[in-house]
């Protein structure tokens, strides 16, 4: 699982790339994305 903390501190990534990784994880884990 990719934690929100990990993603928000992953430097050099665009905001869209963070959203992309969140969404791919959401499709697998069905976590709420709001």
């Amino acid at each position: 699982a990719v934690s929100e903390h990990q993603l928000l501190h992953d430097k050099g990534k665009s905001i869209q790339d963070l959203r992309r990784r969140f969404f791919l994880h959401h499709l697998i884990a069905e976590i709420h994305t709001a």
Epitope: K13, D17, R19, R20, L24, H25, L27, I28, A34
Partner: antibody, heavy 118, light 116 residues
Framework: QVQLVESGGGVVQPGRSLRLSCAAS????????MSWVRQAPGKGLEWVAT????????YYPDSVKGRFTISRDNSKNTLYLQMNSLRAEDTAVYYC???????????WGQGTLVTVSS | QLVLTQSSSASFSLGASAKLTCTLS???????IEWYQQQPLKPPKYVMD???????STGDGIPDRFSGSSSGAERYLTISSLQSEDEADYYC?????????????FGGGTKLTVLG
């Protein structure tokens, strides 16, 4: 190995309905989001629908929203696309695709052709 | 509006290097994209995802002759030592989530012809 086999395509009149199926094997179907992507004859690719692993979340572009419904039966390892109020512009090869943790459309089926014509 | 622009066709000689370009709409210049290959009469195949910093991850079975790079709003797919089987249509694609809605768009595709 990942295998995706689409079926259910054919010739249908405008305004009618059709249901496509995608039989999945070679992986744990219930663990991944799935999508449909289409390609009109001689044209490019167009995303049609996406569904989450358990089926709780679905996503569509405006071009098919309200007419198409993506669903899945994880006990049968099968993905579906219910297409209602079909139009001539829905004529295309329809592919199902599986996501990975890294990307949206990592694995593709061979496709099934839908022709909407009177 | 999220838009990807590709040249419709490109021709390169057998054994040469081909560099294909996908251009993001200017306000989306930082976006990660994906590249797909579609050989004649076959389904599309995932090639790689490509980030703004040029880093990329390739799909299963993609030879290391395929690489990616980025500059500004442009995303490049480079194929070195071109082979006849590289002749195909190449599509870039990009997805985003806005207000809990998902959108995914493809570029128009580039038809790559391998000469000789």
């Amino acid at each position: 190995q990942v295998q995706l086999v689409e079926s259910g395509g054919g010739v249908v009149q405008p305004g009618r309905s059709l249901r496509l199926s995608c039989a999945a094997s070679g992986f744990t179907f219930s663990s991944y989001g799935m999508s449909w992507v289409r390609q009109a004859p001689g044209k490019g690719l167009e995303w049609v629908a996406t569904i989450s692993s358990g089926g709780s979340y679905t996503y569509y572009p405006d071009s098919v929203k309200g007419r198409f419904t993506i669903s899945r039966d994880n006990s049968k390892n099968t993905l579906y696309l219910q297409m209602n109020s079909l139009r001539a512009e829905d004529t295309a090869v329809y592919y199902c695709a599986r996501q990975t943790t890294m990307t949206y459309f990592a694995y593709w089926g061979q496709g099934t052709l839908v022709t909407v014509s009177s | 509006q999220l838009v990807l622009t590709q040249s419709s066709s490109a021709s390169f000689s057998l054994g040469a290097s081909a560099k294909l370009t996908c251009t993001l709409s200017s306000q989306h210049s930082t976006y990660t994209i994906e590249w797909y290959q579609q050989q004649p009469l076959k389904p599309p195949k995932y090639v790689m995802d490509l980030k703004q910093d040029g880093s990329h991850s390739t799909g299963d079975g993609i030879p290391d002759r395929f690489s990616g790079s980025s500059s500004g709003a442009e995303r490049y797919l480079t194929i070195s030592s071109l082979q006849s089987e590289d002749e195909a249509d190449y599509y870039c694609g990009v997805g985003d989530t806005i207000k809990e809605q998902f959108v995914y768009v493809f570029g128009g595709g580039t038809k790559l012809t391998v000469l000789g």
